[in-house]
C-alpha cells in the first residue's frame, strides 16, 4: 500500500530513509538537459524474496540534445512533483547500517540523475530527520516519522523535533500547550478523531545544551 502523501515537513530539516521497504518506488529522474532513454524505466522498484531485497529496473539518462526519430517518454509535470525528495543530502548509504529484511538499501547514483530523488513510500516506512547545517535540534522525542494505515487511510506520524537557529536562545517549546496537530499524535481507537495527550516539559539551559525532562504530569 503506497503512502498517500509525503512525510511531514519540518522547517530547516531534511529527512532520510536508512532503508526502503519492499514496494517503494524511486522515480527515474534526469538532471536538466537529460531525459530517460527510449523505452527506459519510469521508476526503480524495491522487490525481494524471503532472503534478499533489491531494486528492479535501472534508471538511464541520455542527453536531450540527441536526435531520435522515436518519441521519447518524458515525465509529466504532475508525475515529477508527485513525491517530494527525501534526499537533500548525499544519497549514499551510511556505512554502519545493517541491512534489514524486506528492505532495500539506498540505490547507487546513475549517470546524469537529477539532484533530488523522488520516492513513493509504502506503509510501514520509517524516515529520520536531521536539522540542516546552521540549525540545532530541540527534541521532544525521536526525530522520526512512520507511514501508517489508520481507518483505511495512510498518514505519517509527526517527528518530535524542532530546528532552531544557532543564535536563538528560546526555551524548548514544551512549556506551552502542544498544538493539536493531526499528525503524530496517537489516535483514538473509538473514532477517527485525533486526540492529543498533553504533557508538560520542564527545561534547563546548560551551556549550549537544552535539556527536557518528561515530568509525571499527564492528562
Amino acid at each position: 500500500e503506497l503512502c498517500d502523501d509525503d512525510p511531514p515537513e519540518i522547517p530547516h530539516a531534511t529527512f532520510k530513509a536508512m532503508a526502503y521497504k519492499e514496494g517503494t518506488m524511486l522515480n527515474c529522474e534526469c538532471k536538466r538537459g537529460f531525459r530517460r532513454i527510449k523505452s527506459g524505466s519510469l521508476y526503480m522498484l524495491c522487490t525481494g524474496n524471503s532472503s534478499h531485497s533489491s531494486w528492479d529496473n535501472q534508471c538511464q539518462c541520455t542527453s536531450s540534445a540527441t536526435r531520435n526519430t522515436t518519441k521519447q517518454v518524458t515525465p509529466q509535470p504532475e508525475e515529477q512533483k508527485e513525491r517530494k525528495t527525501t534526499e537533500m543530502q548525499s544519497p549514499m548509504q551510511p556505512v554502519d547500517q545493517a541491512s534489514l529484511p524486506g528492505h532495500c538499501r539506498e540505490p547507487p547514483p546513475w549517470e546524469n540523475e537529477a539532484t533530488e530523488r523522488i520516492y513513493h513510500f509504502v506503509v510501514g516506512q520509517m524516515v529520520y530527520y536531521q536539522c540542516v547545517q546552521g540549525y540545532r535540534a530541540l527534541h521532544r522525542g525521536p526525530a522520526e516519522s512512520v507511514c501508517k494505515m489508520t481507518h483505511g487511510k495512510t498518514r505519517w506520524t509527526q517527528p518530535q523535533l524542532i530546528c532552531t537557529g544557532e543564535m536563538e536562545t528560546s526555551q524548548f517549546p514544551g512549556e506551552e500547550k502542544p498544538q493539536a496537530s493531526p499528525e503524530g499524535r496517537p489516535e483514538s481507537e473509538t473514532s477517527c478523531l485525533v486526540t492529543t495527550t498533553d504533557f508538560q516539559i520542564q527545561t534547563e539551559m546548560a551551556a549550549t545544551m537544552e535539556t527536557s525532562i518528561f515530568t509525571t504530569e499527564y492528562q
Partner: antibody, heavy 119, light 106 residues
C-alpha cells in the same frame, strides 16, 4: 561495525555517586542519539535517559534530579553521572543506539554494566 | 505515561508450536517495537515500527497491531526462541517498555 561498550559499574554505598561510560565505535555521536536503559535484577527494562545527536537531552522524570547524561563527541564516549544512589538503582545499565539518527528503535546495544548499591 | 501491559506473563509452549504474545497500551500509540532477551544477555532488537523485522531475524517472527493492541507472533517455535520478549513505545513521552513475556519450554 557499530559497537557500544559500557564501563564504570561497581559496588557503591547508598548516597554515593558513580559515573558510567559508554564508548562507541563504527559511527559518530554527532549523527546518532544514544540512550541509557536499565534493568534491575529479575525485572524488566526501564528507560533512563537520552542524549540526541545535537546534544539536547531527555530524562526519565523519576531520575532527572539525580542522573545527568553527557557526551564527548571527540572521544566517542557517552557518560551517565549518577548521584545520591539508592538501593533501587541497583541494575544492569545498558547504552543503546537507534537504527536511524535520532530514532526510537534501539537496534544496537552494549553488553551492559552492573551497578550495585549496597551498604 | 503510557503503560504497556504484556500478556501472558509466562507462556509455556513446545518447539514447533505457534506463539502469540500480546502488548496492550493504556492509550493509543502510533507503533510498537519488540525486543528479545535471554539470561545474561543484552536485549536483541526484533521488530520495529510494529511489523518490520530487524537484521538477522528469521521470517517466522512477525508483528502486527494498531492503536492499543499489538501482537508478536512466532509461527513455529525453535529451541532458540525461548526467552523474554519486551514491547516498547515512544509515540508519547516518556518512552516505556512492557513488563515482558517469558516464553518457556513446556
Amino acid at each position: 561495525q557499530v559497537q557500544l561498550v559500557e564501563s564504570g559499574g561497581g559496588v557503591v554505598q547508598p548516597g554515593g555517586s558513580l559515573r558510567l561510560s559508554c564508548a562507541v565505535s563504527g559511527f559518530s555521536l554527532t549523527s546518532y542519539g544514544i540512550q541509557w536503559v536499565r534493568q534491575a535484577p529479575g525485572k524488566g527494562l526501564e528507560w533512563v535517559s537520552v542524549i540526541w545527536a545535537g546534544g539536547s537531552t531527555n530524562y526519565n522524570s523519576a531520575l532527572m534530579s539525580r542522573f545527568t547524561i553527557s557526551k564527548d563527541n571527540s572521544k566517542s564516549t557517552l557518560y551517565l553521572q549518577m548521584n545520591s544512589l539508592r538501593a533501587e538503582d541497583t541494575a544492569v545499565y545498558y547504552c543503546a543506539r537507534a537504527y536511524g539518527y535520532d530514532g526510537s528503535w534501539l537496534a544496537y546495544w552494549g553488553q551492559g554494566t552492573l551497578v550495585t548499591v549496597s551498604s | 505515561e503510557i503503560v504497556l501491559t504484556q500478556s501472558p506473563a509466562t507462556l509455556s509452549l513446545s518447539p514447533g508450536e505457534r506463539a502469540t504474545l500480546s502488548c496492550r497500551a493504556s492509550s493509543s500509540v502510533s507503533y510498537m517495537h519488540w525486543y528479545q532477551q535471554k539470561p545474561g544477555q543484552a536485549p536483541r532488537p526484533l521488530i520495529f515500527a510494529t511489523s518490520n523485522l530487524a537484521s538477522g531475524i528469521p521470517a517466522r517472527f512477525s508483528g502486527s497491531g494498531s492503536g492499543t493492541d499489538f501482537t508478536l507472533t512466532i509461527s513455529s517455535l525453535e529451541p532458540e526462541d525461548f526467552a523474554v520478549y519486551y514491547c516498547q513505545q515512544w509515540s508519547s513521552n516518556p518512552p516505556t517498555f512492557g513488563g515482558g513475556t517469558k516464553l518457556e519450554i513446556k
